[in-house]
């Protein structure tokens, strides 16, 4: 039994890191393998992650971690029984994929303005709380070409757009994702989408 693709890990910079790897053949990850991990820290202890299958030869492990700080470094040991298959390390701050924003809501009762709000996925004491920026994706369910992205580069988790920038009388969906420039993170997953019917008063045309 050998590792074909070494484990690569990403952290949510809060409490979970996800590691994925591939074996050289079909493997029952949960019965044959164990991923041991330990924070390099005087008061830490070793933990064991039981991997799940991720395709025939692929394995994935969700590591529960202490609250992350930038200096953290974890040792990783992949075992098959008594055989050490791979040994490595992982710095969560260097491989961050933020959590997805939540609670996306579209407020349509503000005089021909659409107000989209969502929740920051981090608690206020987390470093990323004040460092996230967002992308909001709005698209028409009726017209695949009617697809737009709004970049929200300020910290407030909200976006205002004029209802008239979208077509009236049709349904739209929106979703939002996050990233943090400070740690050069990847984008988060998209939030669940929310749907609304766009309608606004057309201005009278004067001839």
């Amino acid at each position: 039994m050998k590792v074909l693709q070494e484990p690569t890990c990403v952290s949510d910079y809060m409490s979970i890191s996800t590691c994925e790897w591939k074996m050289n053949g079909p493997t029952n990850c949960s019965t044959e393998l164990r991923l041991l991990y330990q924070l390099v820290f005087l008061l830490s202890e070793a933990h064991t992650c039981i991997p799940e299958n991720n395709g025939g030869a692929g394995c994935v492990c969700h590591l529960l971690m202490d609250d992350v700080v930038s200096a953290d470094n974890y040792t990783l040991d992949l075992w098959a029984g008594q055989q050490l298959l791979w040994k490595g390390s992982f710095k969560p701050s260097e491989h961050v994929k933020p959590r997805a924003p939540g609670n996306l809501t579209v407020h349509t009762n503000v005089s021909d303005t659409l107000l989209l709000t969502w929740s920051n996925p981090y608690p206020p004491d987390n470093y990323l709380y004040n460092h996230l920026t967002y992308a909001v994706n709005i698209w028409s369910e009726n017209d695949p070409a009617d697809f737009r992205i709004y970049n929200v580069t300020y910290l407030e988790p909200s976006l205002r757009i004029a209802a008239s920038t979208l077509k009236s009388g049709i349904s739209y969906r929106a979703r939002v994702r996050a990233w943090a420039q400070c740690y050069n993170t990847t984008w988060s997953e998209w939030s669940p989408s929310t749907k609304w019917h766009n309608s606004y008063r057309e201005p009278f045309e004067q001839h």
């Epitope: 820290f41 008061l43 202890e45 971690m65 609250d67 700080v69 953290d72 004491d125």
Partner: antibody, heavy 115, light 109 residues
Framework: EVQLVQSGGGLVHPGGSLRLSCAGS????????MFWVRQAPGKGLEWVSG???????NYADSVKGRFTISRDNAKNSLYLQMNSLRAEDMAVYYC?????????WGQGTLVTVSS | EIVLTQSPGTLSLSPGERATLSCRAS???????LAWYQQKPGQAPRLLIY???SRATGIPDRFSGSGSGTDFTLTISRLEPEDFAVYYC??????????FGQGTKVEIK
Amino acid sequence: EVQLVQSGGGLVHPGGSLRLSCAGSGFTFSRNAMFWVRQAPGKGLEWVSGIGTGGATNYADSVKGRFTISRDNAKNSLYLQMNSLRAEDMAVYYCARGRYYFPWWGQGTLVTVSS
Amino acid sequence: EIVLTQSPGTLSLSPGERATLSCRASQSVSSSYLAWYQQKPGQAPRLLIYGASSRATGIPDRFSGSGSGTDFTLTISRLEPEDFAVYYCQQYDHSAGWTFGQGTKVEIK
């Protein structure tokens, strides 16, 4: 808002015992290492003890064998049991949350050791 | 045990002046694990700098940290009235644990 609220200080005779408490809120207590740091009157800061998320502990040589750090994650609380207290243990004791350094501190509680 | 020695013991300066505080370690310290704190009378210490040079949340940019190995420096570019306090450096080591310097008092001249 992160808060560390301390209690349990007071006057104790040499050789006596005292238990300090620190209640945490505004963060996930169980995912954080916790510490005690003290400051004798007019002196500098001295690290006393730390406890990891899994219960691993460490002590300064000056308190080893006399002080015991513990935590109760269900109550979001940190404790320091101090036995065989000496005059040189008299200080303001701070609880702190952190790891390699200490971003969050309690308000401090004074322990007076006097006959 | 790693010993941190701060100098000077007391720094007498006027508001608006630049303050340079030194912290020297008895053996090499990882920059990732070097921090600076400010403490005012009757208050808990406040983290200013971590990782030798990163400002903690809410700390004004007049505070900066630098250094590596055994020599570290905290600089306050222009002293404000509220900056007069005692400053401590602190290190963490995987085997020796946590130690503080003895402190530098920045007082009004």
